[in-house]
């Protein structure tokens, strides 16, 4: 025999108090699948948590973090403090990146500058706490007599249009 509750769609619950008819989820609750015997309470985004998506009868609310914080954990269950660019969050708070490392975001860890010489290149722009180094042409390309400029295209004879 088929369970009468299996006919109840998302956004409703199978109400045992009313002969197992499908009743809509009450305010501030939802059911994301059919055949539910109860609706789940909507998540409330309070304090540091801001509402990114309102709760509906078929889906939970989604939260993100207020400026100065960023989401951590499944479904943004926590908000971690931002640092400034050029810093990382340690057990003692936000600390500047050590020399030779950088962080171009407000979260995450300081990463080592790119080692240009590993690719046979030279440093074009030095790195900072906030920015990685910019690698340029290889030192061989910069040796005297060598040109890093692309040779110009051959000039056309005047009066001749391209074929």
């Amino acid at each position: 025999l088929q369970d009468p509750c299996s006919n109840c769609p998302a956004g409703t619950f199978c109400d045992n108090n009313r002969n197992q008819i499908c009743s809509p989820c009450p305010p501030n609750s939802f059911s994301s699948a059919g055949g539910q015997r109860t609706c789940d309470i909507c998540r409330q985004c309070k304090g540091v948590f801001r509402t990114r998506k309102e709760c509906s009868s078929t889906s939970n609310a989604e939260c993100d973090c207020t400026p100065g914080f960023h989401c951590l954990g499944a479904g943004c269950s926590m908000c971690e403090q931002d640092c400034k660019q050029g810093q990382e969050l340690t057990k003692k708070g936000c600390k500047d990146c050590c020399f030779g490392t950088f962080n171009d975001q407000k979260r995450g860890i300081c990463r080592p500058w790119t080692n240009c010489s590993l690719d046979g290149k030279s440093v074009l722009v030095n790195g900072t706490k906030e920015r990685d180094v910019v690698c340029g042409p290889s030192p061989a390309d910069l040796s005297p007599g060598a040109s890093s400029v692309t040779p110009p295209a051959p000039a056309r004879e005047p009066g001749h249009s391209p074929q």
Partner: nanobody
Framework: QVQLVESGGGLVQPGGSLRLSCSAS????????MSWVRQAPGKGLEWVSD????????FYEDSVKGRFTISRDNAKNTLYLQMNSLRAEDTAVYYC?????????????????WGQGTLVTVSA
Amino acid sequence: QVQLVESGGGLVQPGGSLRLSCSASGFTFSSYAMSWVRQAPGKGLEWVSDINSGGESTFYEDSVKGRFTISRDNAKNTLYLQMNSLRAEDTAVYYCAKHPLTYTIATMNDYDYWGQGTLVTVSA
């Protein structure tokens, strides 16, 4: 071991003020966000306020905004809740709670340590 001990509760008339304190020990207080949570008689737990580790970011339940002020003294390892313009509906046991990760604010379900609570009664 982590210990949180609240004090400062009592009987106060409507419109009056109280200042709750929460003395913390057993962890690096200055690295953790802290919260106040309350439980009115016969009701569930209700989040009241959060403060981040450094004290520069504070957050409040709508019903207490403008009346309650959360603060902390990291040198004294103490959390405070200044409660002004108290109402009968503020009657509850007030708990302080610690957040589980450094420099992170969690939801109430994830707080890892709670005090034993202090009772605030607002009545004429």
